[in-house]
Amino acid sequence: FNISGCSTKKLLWTYSTRSEEEFVLFCDLPEPQKSHFCHRNRLSPKQVPEHLPFMGSNDLSDVQWYQQPSNGDPLEDIRKSYPHIIQDKCTLHFLTPGVNNSGSYICRPKMIKSPYDVACCVKMILEVKPQTNASCEYSASHKQDLLLGSTGSISCPSLSCQSDAQSPAVTWYKNGKLLSVERSNRIVVDEVYDYHQGTYVCDYTQSDTVSSWTVRAVVQVRTIVGDTKLKPDILDPVEDTLEVELGKPLTISCKARFGFERVFNPVIKWYIKDSDLEWEVSVPEAKSIKSTLKDEIIERNIILEKVTQRDLRRKFVCFVQNSIGNTTQSVQLKEKR
């Protein structure tokens, strides 16, 4: 189809080489009831269509995305770029930053219902640049945490070095929906609830003498509980002696509960004490068996191929640790009578 009639939008993605961030393009087709943009040839050049995320269909995945090769080849279906670029509803997600994402992306409805609809399309010219060292050193992260039950804020990474006073008007989206009341470079949350979690997008317009473009950043916001003030506790083994049969295989499980920590480096290991000696045992990997907002239960097993007389003289110690401290639980084997 002929893309010369498409509305054009320029976007800039400045990515940090230090972080793994993603980017999105919305299919900014207008709402039919608010604009005649899809019947573009009826508009006079002075009439500017209103740009809003596409709401013209009940099924928001009813748009088709294309990529325009720089060499002038025919348009390519965006699905060819899977899994680096993924479409979800009317949004295109770029999973890996890089200048190779620069280019033109076109979206239009899948169902063309009238000859006028052929021109109902948007061409997005995306420029992707790595962040220069000269840029603000302490820019906000693309992953931000909000503490449940407290006040918090979400900052637009591309504007976080500017004061509120000098910041341009910002357009915010959450999970693809326009947040019409938010216009500043920071969203202030009076009390954080679970529903504040999501993918936020902030846009602002930058202009020079020649043209203007939209600078966009994506922020992943997690709602979390506060870091634990407790060291982990061992849930199993509870008893410090265990009845066993000599010559039989044995598995002893150590289950420990770790409170939430933003920087989570849990340690769970087994070691053996034999008179004055002690050594760590090579055991299967630890596994998370339950995870909630507040804590995580991790299990690690020690496996004896067969219980020997020597094992009865040893102590098997489970050691667990987080940033607060450590806990141990030892088990002495006792022959079953």
Epitope: L60, S61, I86, K89, Y195, Q197
Partner: nanobody, 117 residues
Framework: QLQLLESGGGLVQAGGSLRLSCAAS?????????MGWYRQAPGKGRELVSS???????NYVDSVKGRFTISRDNSKKTLYLQMNSLRAEDTAVYYC??????????LGQGTLVTVSS
């Protein structure tokens, strides 16, 4: 924290079928994310096999198109992968994970699928 737990793997003859399931621990995280199935064959890197958006749009790598079907049930916080006409080269550990969203990169612990020829 988000926990993902896969099930449904096993040993199957070439040409057979399996259905993998993945249960998530948080509904608010699950429903707003693009979820997917990754696999890692012995001695190879992990690849994204298929993904499904919050609106239900699906994607597949060429090698599984027409044979695998991804689906999700947001009310049950569960992701599925129906695998038909299985081939020996489908043998791998299959992981369910968040492809796009807040917990992007979160993976389950994997379920082994072995296809014997």
């Amino acid at each position: 924290q988000l926990q993902l737990l896969e099930s449904g793997g096993g040993l199957v003859q070439a040409g057979g079928s399996l259905r993998l399931s993945c249960a998530a621990s948080r509904s608010i995280t699950f429903s707003h994310n693009v979820m997917g199935w990754y696999r890692q064959a012995p001695g190879k890197g992990r690849e994204l096999v298929s993904s499904i958006g919050s609106g239900g749009s699906t994607n597949y790598v060429d090698s599984v198109k027409g044979r695998f079907t991804i689906s999700r049930d947001n009310s049950k916080k569960t992701l599925y992968l129906q695998m038909n006409s299985l081939r020996a080269e489908d043998t791998a550990v299959y992981y369910c994970g968040v492809v796009v969203g807040v917990y992007r990169g979160s993976l389950g612990q994997g379920t082994l699928v072995t296809v014997s020829s």
